[in-house]
């Protein structure tokens, strides 16, 4: 097992999950850890505990390894980090990779007020309702940026979008969560359509830093606590 030595550490590896950081309960997921060509061992940690290791064979590429989780459950959802060893030295820890299990217990209902097709600049609010009591709701825009809105609520949460712009167009789903890494089944998708004239610059989306309460859930965050931009369904954390 890795021994912490702050002196003389190797650069941190990159960690990512395929096909996604969100995994349906019972499905498999691959966690990749990319270090150095000279690496003799990679170790994967889960919630701070030693989870798995791999000693790459010299015949294979040694700069990255794949850790396979055969069945994702609430017991394997959470924060993963990896390290690698080269010679006598260990690397620094990778950035945290936060894996979420979905498909637990129940399916929420998602709807949009006043309606799914609105004109540019109209105020829009999404509502997410789950029969089983939960602690937090998450609203995701499919194939968009990585922004994930969250709201606390027992059975229902509302997500005010404010005056909508063309950037709000797209398909949304919501989840109820039982903890930050254990989510319900996804709601049926709701597609928001925006009609209207030429977009006015005064209707541009609010600077996200002014609404951290909506956007704070960090599956992988940069310094401001906002989501990094990258394809949501294939997430890599690095640097």
């Amino acid at each position: 097992q890795r021994i912490n030595t702050e002196k003389e550490t190797l650069p941190k590896p990159i960690i990512w999950a395929k096909p996604s950081i969100m995994v349906t309960n019972g499905n498999s997921v691959n966690i990749w850890c990319q270090g150095a060509q000279s690496a003799s061992e990679y170790q994967l940690y889960f919630e701070g505990s030693f989870f798995a290791l791999e000693r790459p064979k010299p015949s294979r590429s040694m700069n990255k390894v794949r850790f396979f989780i055969s069945q994702m459950t609430s017991h394997t959802a959470g924060i993963y980090t990896c390290f690698y060893q080269s010679g006598e030295l260990w690397s620094k820890s990778s950035n945290p990779l936060k894996l979420v299990v979905t498909g637990l217990y129940d399916t929420p209902n998602l709807w949009v007020y006043p309606r799914p097709e609105v004109t540019l600049g109209e105020n829009v609010t999404f509502f997410c309702q789950l029969k089983t009591a939960t602690s937090k709701f998450f609203l995701l825009k499919e194939r968009g940026s990585n922004h994930i809105q969250n709201k606390y609520g027992n059975i229902q949460a509302e997500f005010p979008m404010g005056p909508v712009t063309r950037a709000h167009r797209g398909t949304y789903r919501c989840f109820g969560s039982y903890n930050d890494y254990a989510w319900s089944f996804p709601s049926e998708p709701v597609t928001l359509l925006i009609t209207g004239g030429v977009e006015n610059s005064s209707l541009a989306p609010t600077d996200p830093t002014s609404s951290l309460d909506y956007w704070e859930f960090d599956l992988s965050t940069n310094e401001s606590g906002l989501q990094k931009d990258s394809a949501f369904w294939d997430h890599t954390t690095q640097n």
Epitope: N30, F46, S49, F50, F51, A52, L53, E54, R55, P56, K57, V65, R66, F67, F68, I69, S70, Q71, T73, H75, T76
Partner: nanobody, 126 residues
Amino acid sequence: EVQLVESGGGEVQPGGSLRLSCAASGRTFASAAMGWFRQAPGKEREFVAAISRSDDTYYAESVKGRFTISRDNAKNTVYLQMSSLRAEDTAVYYCAAVVPTYGNNIYVHSAAYNYWGQGTLVTVKP
């Protein structure tokens, strides 16, 4: 569906040896990573040893040099050879499998394992 059945437990004196076996049903054994865990009375289950599908091994510090894990894919069986046994090795020993797995992965955390045996009791006393 994989079923794991442990055998070989029993009572032994300090310094003695035992070999535990874990027989797996099904044709997926060769693609499984295997592990042994143990649980002493009143304590949490702890990792003992693990072996990858390509025979790489890893041991808990407390058993390193005394226990050896091995597998026989032809017999669908994994073994734990235990020697220089101590009173603190007294526990129920569980065999576990990760099916399927990939490459050379060795799993140390119990959450990684998706199949478990019922356990076999090992008692070390004078």
